[in-house]
């Protein structure tokens, strides 16, 4: 019998030029006769012009929905009705070859042509992309809030805030041909649920989405986006309703910058430079292509390249890269965020150098991309360290630590957090280790102990990047670099003359006079420590309600014990920054870091000072008692203690303390307490710091309170951030 | 590499006294609980005694309470009992034993022991 | 009479798959972590788990322990002669405010 065909509707957005029409300010108001008038007579020629083409038989509807500069350019959408065999025959690129053909076919004709009546359209003007029903709701829904802007070369226009009548809105936004478009969104309040979309065309096609943000949010205060050229658009939905634009848009037109470079490396190790996307730290834009060709001295070294919170990934069965594709001598990668460093290593086998490209694959992007480059000896990558084939990173082996993701750097390790001596493979403490005593059957660990040795996991490097072998040699009062850089930036550390924390003690005053309070409106919500003049150190997740996340509500008080009363040595401060770990993740826990900076310099006295930062390679040895100070709970869900409670703890091996929270605990953790509970941070200590008195009587801070089951649950240990873990973060702040 | 020696065992009459010692070498013994566990003969494990790393907390069992004493010597790596108005009863091996990580009840490394005989 | 119950003895033959009980209360096996010790003839003892469930470094995964309530369980699978031995349990009692071991038990190897 018959059966009837099967008609689907195809949808599609484009823009047209009009050379002999000038664009005018009334053509940007909906509501004024001139744009009424425009758009009925362009609606008819562009009805006109599909109906001219083979197309005709399936045209369903059009619209005409805003102009713009260039002399005149209409923007559009249409429908075709089309039988679904014949679908994939009339793509964007079929229909706009054909719509192309019937404008070039009239160009020179006397005949008259209906839809040449009144415009004289620029056939190589026209643009035809591919669009969807749900597309044309989306821009339909913004109609009553829709803004035209033309930005011109040199000019940064800052765009008027959304109507909050409406609960959408557009800006459409042009440049001067040639150039691309660099919008920035800055959010201004600490809470919102606004979202925003920026779109690579004239209007919100989800196949053109650039990328989309949401909520005011904390991690991206700033966000610049880049189209690929002189169009782009804005789309706001309406969160919560707020008298206030809880953020500012502003445009600028700017020059293509080229994306290809040819360096030859020089005949050294570490990071030589830095190669980035256009506009770094901008979005970088829709079909973005960076080529960069580097040479390397010799085929004895490597290239390495070291990403920040960005990994390269194989993809599987050729699916587009979502978050940039990258090909390294001819392997294909896939970009992908992450909240780690990583780095990727290249063994070169060639002297013609290495190749390496970036390319936007989609329309959606993302942060601007940075990686610096440098060399790597190929027969050692990792001098007195584990090469982590993982991410490419060197980490310290048989340290106690898993730094290894799959744990490589703490396997076969004949001496492992201990010294290997040389006669005998035996293994001793860290702290025997050039303390004068020989404690190996021929002394070698108190060998080499006043010069310079290779740098490993346990030696510290001095400001010459010389490494010694005497463990935790900060401080001590003798100077163990040749250029003394061990005893320098020494006071810290020392408590005050002196005579919440679950099992604790009342603390006296200048105790522990680095210890902080930082409030809110007269609330003590999280501890801290001072580490330098102006900078406080705490916990990430004290900042983890959006509510909690504007420094003008902070207030830190140091010297204090007592909360309910103030004594002389007591200071308080504002915040003027406050600075997440960019790594930091609210459901790990992990890089559970946060520095506050002080609105003014802390004068030092006998009830405030700082304490000592370790190095990367202070080594806390699992055993040891510290101590953690706060005022938090006294018990389980208890309210907070009015004086400093101290209590001191046990370091536990990490390898017993993720064995115990099944494997909850990363390299960034450091976990102390009793096996038998009782003696434990609680809420309202976090934050504050995990302090451990060296030999040289001087106080390392070891770790910030972090979480733990509970307080004083027998069974399960507290988990304090550990400083060594971060400590290259805290110092690129702090100096 | 962990070590613990224990010495001072031996006959010793009813109500006599007896000091008995631990060397520990091997791990860093200022920063670990210690104990002492017995066991008499044919008979099960008793836990005698605990002291903390720095010697602020001791605790005994019942049955040795005010009789023996539990004490460290850091500077010396050694633990000590000392073990007043001995009884029959008092009869056993005595190991000495390490904490664990945390304190308090995990004994991961023991002596091989010293044998008290209290008798007449 | 021992704060701690085990069952005095248990046997089982060669590859099998053994379980000691422990039982206690709340202010020691249901408040505090257990841990399981080995005893070999003449020896002294050797901590096998801690924590309820963690295996000591250097012994053997077919010893597993685990902790429900107010009792715990040693099991030990693929059973070895080497096995024979003395087991006991151990916490920590809030109430007597020391280390309590249970009677221990004798396995055997048929």
């Known amino acids: 019998g018959y059966k009837a065909e099967v008609m689907v509707s195809q949808v599609y957005s484009g823009s047209l030029r009009v050379l002999n029409r000038h664009f005018s300010q009334d053509l940007t108001r909906r509501e004024s006769s001139a744009f009424r008038s425009e758009t009925a007579k362009a609606q008819k020629m562009l009805k006109e012009l599909i109906t001219s083409t083979r197309l005709g038989t399936y045209y369903n509807s059009s619209s005409v929905y805003s102009f713009g500069e260039g002399p005149l350019t209409c923007f559009f959408w249409f429908i075709l009705q089309i039988p679904e065999h014949r679908r994939l025959m009339l793509s964007p690129e079929v229909v706009q070859a054909l719509l192309v053909e019937e404008l070039l076919s009239t160009v020179n004709s006397s005949a008259a042509v209906p839809y040449r009546a009144e415009y004289e359209v620029d056939p190589e003007g026209l643009v035809i992309l591919e669009a969807s029903v749900k597309d044309i709701a989306a821009l339909n829904s913004t109609l009553g809030c829709y803004r035209y802007s033309y930005v011109g070369q040199g000019q940064v226009l800052r765009l008027k805030g959304p109507d909050h009548l409406a609960s959408s809105c557009l800006w459409h936004l042009q440049g001067p041909k040639d150039l691309m478009l660099k919008l920035r969104l800055e959010w201004t309040l600490a809470e919102c649920r606004d979202r925003l979309a920026m779109y690579d065309v004239a209007g919100p096609l989800e196949k053109r989405l650039i990328t989309s943000v949401y909520g005011c949010s904390r991690q991206e205060p700033v966000v610049e986006v880049l189209a690929s050229g002189a169009i782009m658009a804005v789309v706001w939905k309406k969160g919560l309703h707020s008298y206030y634009d809880p953020f500012v848009l502003s445009v600028q037109p700017v020059v293509f910058q080229a994306c290809e470079v040819n360096l030859t490396l020089d005949n050294r190790l570490d990071s030589q430079g830095v190669l980035s996307t256009p506009y770094f730290p901008s979005y970088y834009s829709p079909q973005t292509h960076c080529s960069w060709h580097l040479t390397v001295p010799s085929l004895d070294y490597g290239l390495a390249l070291w990403f920040d919170a960005y990994a390269l990934r194989r993809q599987k069965y050729d699916l587009p890269c979502t978050q940039g594709q990258w090909t390294i001598q001819n392997r294909r990668l896939c970009g992908l965020r992450i909240l780690q460093p990583y780095a990727e290593r290249i063994p070169v086998v060639a002297t013609a150098g290495i190749t390496i490209n970036f390319t936007s694959q989609i329309s959606l992007t993302g942060p601007g991309v940075r990686v610096h480059y440098g060399l790597y000896n190929q027969s050692d990558p990792c001098p007195g360290e584990f090469l982590c084939s993982v991410n490419g990173l060197c980490v310290p082996a048989c340290d106690g630590v898993k730094d290894c993701p799959n744990g490589l750097d703490e396997r076969n390790c004949v001496c492992r957090a201990t010294f290997q001596c040389k006669e005998d493979s035996t293994c001793i403490s860290l702290p025997k280790v050039c303390d004068g005593q020989p404690d190996c059957l021929n002394g070698s660990d108190e060998e080499q102990c006043q010069e310079g040795v290779p740098c490993g996991t346990f030696t510290f490097q001095c400001e010459d990047r010389s490494c010694v072998k005497k463990p935790n040699p900060q401080c001590d009062g003798r100077p163990d670099c040749r250029d003394g850089s061990d005893e320098e930036h020494c006071d810290c550390g020392l408590q005050g003359p002196s005579s919440r924390i679950v099992g604790g003690a009342v603390s006296s005053e200048g105790e522990w006079p680095w210890q902080a309070s930082l409030q809110v409106r007269g609330r003590h919500i999280c501890g801290g420590a001072l580490i330098a003049d102006r900078w406080v150190i705490t916990a990430a997740h004290c900042f983890q309600e959006d509510s909690m996340a504007s420094t003008v509500l902070w207030t830190v008080f140091l010297g204090k014990v007592w909360q309910n009363s103030r004594w002389p040595g007591e200071v308080s401060f504002k915040v003027s920054r406050l600075l997440l770990h960019p790594y930091h993740e609210e459901d790990s826990h992990d890089y559970d870091v946060a520095l506050l900076q002080l609105d003014h310099p802390v004068v030092r006295s006998a009830a405030v000072r700082p304490v000592c930062l370790p190095a990367r390679s202070h080594f806390f040895e699992p055993g040891l008692h510290c101590w953690i100070t706060g005022w938090g709970a006294l018990r389980e869900g208890g309210p907070i203690s009015n004086a400093l409670q101290k209590v001191d703890v046990q370091l536990i091996p990490q390898d017993l303390c993720s064995e115990v929270y099944r494997y909850q605990v990363t390299p960034r953790m450091l976990c102390a307490g009793y096996r038998k509970g009782k003696k434990d941070a609680c809420q309202g200590d976090s934050g504050g710091p995990l302090v451990c008195k060296a030999l040289s009587g001087r106080w390392f801070l070891a770790g910030l309170v972090s979480w733990g089951l509970g307080c004083g649950r027998p069974n399960y240990f507290g988990v304090y951030t550990r400083i060594t873990g971060v400590i290259s973060w805290i110092q690129q702040v702090v100096t | 590499q962990v070590q613990l020696v224990e010495s001072g065992g031996g006959v010793v009459q009813p109500g006599r006294s007896l000091r008995l010692s631990c060397a520990a070498s091997?791990?860093?013994?200022?920063?670990?609980?210690m104990d002492w566990v017995r066991q008499a003969p044919g008979r099960g494990l008793e836990w005698v005694a605990l002291?903390?790393?720095?010697?602020?907390?001791?605790y005994y069992a019942d049955s040795v309470k005010g009789r023996f004493t539990i004490s460290r010597d850091n500077s010396k790596n050694t633990l000590y009992l000392q073990m007043n108005s001995l009884r029959g009863e008092d009869t056993a091996v005595y190991f000495c034993?390490?904490?664990?990580?945390?304190?308090?009840?995990?004994?991961?490394?023991w002596g091989q022991g010293t044998l008290v005989t209290v008798s007449s | 009479q021992s704060v701690l119950t085990q069952p005095p003895s248990v046997s089982e033959a060669p590859r099998q798959r053994v379980t000691i009980s422990c039982s206690g209360s709340?202010?020691?096996?249901?408040?505090?972590?257990v841990n399981w010790y080995q005893q070999l003839p003449g020896k002294a003892p050797k901590l096998l788990i801690s924590y309820d469930y963690v295996v000591s470094s250097g012994v053997s995964d077919r010893f597993s322990g685990s902790k429900s309530g107010t009792s715990a369980s040693l099991a030990i699978s693929g059973l070895q002669s080497a096995d024979e031995a003395d087991y006991y349990c151990?916490?920590?009692?809030?109430?007597?405010?020391?280390?309590?071991f249970g009677g221990g038990t004798k396995l055997t190897v048929l």
């Open positions: 034993a390490k904490e664990g990580y945390g304190g308090y009840d995990g004994f991961d490394y």
């Open positions: 151990s916490t920590w009692d809030d109430g007597l405010n020391g280390v309590v």
């Open positions: 002291i903390s790393y720095d010697g602020s907390k001791k």
């Open positions: 709340t202010s020691n096996i249901g408040n505090n972590a």
């Open positions: 091997g791990f860093t013994f200022s920063n670990f609980d």
